[in-house]
């Protein structure tokens, strides 16, 4: 998955970090997403599992900002890889889960 | 308001060598994915070229190994490369605001022209 | 390569009425059952402008006369009621496999 550099992955976490906070009734009314595994990929991973929330304004700047980072399609079976097996979350957890990684990544420097 | 402005456009002699420029602003540039699309004379509309935030690039075989895709995040400039020019290659450069494959070219420049002849 | 084609390659349509723009693709163009299918509008002597992405969804600040639906190969974008501000080409797009491909357009004039 490509790897942004520090100022796009600060811009994504200070975007998460705005939908957590600005959290009033429950975020895109509770729906449920794929969870991913987060070690591998999770740029293009987060987006294919977001992008199946419809008609929630609240994530589409997130969905536009990963859409960023991996631009053009990847393989179909590089997706199903990634997703973890039949398990769904709440957008709020699946948002929540991605902010501590991303959080953990730029501590790391892991964005070059 | 977003606004990207292209420019470097010009008459070149086949087999000769343009690079365009593209300034953006009124949005995160490091934050988006960024492409340039070209239309023909005949009004076709043809995909160029892509880079994602992260700079990882993308092209069609038919520019492949002559054109180059590039961005400068800290003075928020997209470039566009080409070598190798051939009369095919004449048309109006765009600038693209790239949002992904889930939403599409969301904004364009007004375009610089390119025309390859000798 | 995906080849996208329009039809018609040009309408005239009286103003307040409908009009309806086809763009069939030579193979699917949907994901995960999501339709990569986008359309532009190029009013002239200007650069194109993004109306749809995914299929159906509507660009912000894009009025709702504008639609789009279709899915896998066939897709079509619906104006209704036309404006006068409405003449334009129109242009399809996919971006479910590269390369990347457009439609040859279609011209919109007022009857």
């Known amino acids: 998955s490509p790897v942004p550099p520090s100022t796009a992955l600060k811009e994504l976490i200070e975007e998460l970090v705005n939908i957590t906070q600005n959290q009033k009734a429950p975020l895109c009314n509770g729906s449920m997403v794929w969870s991913i595994n987060l070690t591998a990929g999770v740029y293009c991973a987060a987006l294919e599992s977001l992008i199946n929330v419809s008609g929630c304004s609240a994530i589409e700047k997130t969905q536009r900002m990963l859409n960023g980072f991996c631009p053009h399609k990847v393989s179909a079976g590089q997706f199903s890889s990634l997703r973890v097996r039949d398990t769904k979350i709440e957008v709020a957890q699946f948002v929540k889960d991605l902010l501590v990684h991303l959080k953990k990544l730029f501590r790391e420097g892991q964005f070059n | 308001e977003v606004k990207l402005v292209e420019s470097g456009g010009g008459l070149v002699k086949p087999g000769g060598s343009l690079k365009l420029s593209c300034a953006a602003s009124?949005?995160?540039?490091?934050?988006?994915?960024m492409s340039w699309v070209r239309q023909t004379p005949e009004k076709r509309l043809e995909w160029v070229a892509s880079?994602?935030?992260?700079?990882?690039?993308y092209y069609p075989d038919s520019v492949k190994g002559r054109f180059t895709i590039s961005r400068d995040n800290a003075r928020n400039i997209l470039y566009l490369q080409m070598s190798s020019l051939r009369s095919e290659d004449t048309a109006m450069y765009y600038c693209?605001?790239?949002?992904?494959?889930?939403?599409?070219?969301?904004?364009w420049g007004q375009g610089t022209t390119v025309t390859v002849s000798s | 390569d995906i080849v996208l084609t329009q039809s018609p390659a040009s309408l005239a349509v009286s103003l307040g009425q409908r009009a309806t723009i086809s763009c069939k693709a030579s193979?699917?163009?949907?994901?995960?059952?999501?339709?990569?299918m986008h359309w532009y509008q190029q009013k002239p002597g200007q650069s194109p402008k993004l109306l749809i992405y995914?299929?159906?969804n509507l660009e912000s600040g894009i009025p709702a006369r504008f639609s789009g639906s279709g899915s896998r190969t066939d897709f079509t974008l619906t104006i209704n009621p036309v404006e006068a501000d409405d003449v334009a080409t129109y242009y399809c797009?996919?971006?479910?496999?590269?390369?990347?491909?457009f439609g040859g357009g279609t011209k919109l004039e007022i009857k």
């Open positions: 693209a605001r790239l949002d992904g494959y889930y939403f599409g070219f969301a904004y």
């Open positions: 009124g949005f995160t540039f490091i934050s988006y994915a």
């Open positions: 880079i994602s935030s992260g700079g990882n690039t």
């Open positions: 193979e699917s163009v949907d994901n995960y059952g999501k339709s990569l």
């Open positions: 995914r299929a159906s």
């Open positions: 797009q996919q971006s479910n496999e590269d390369p990347w491909t």
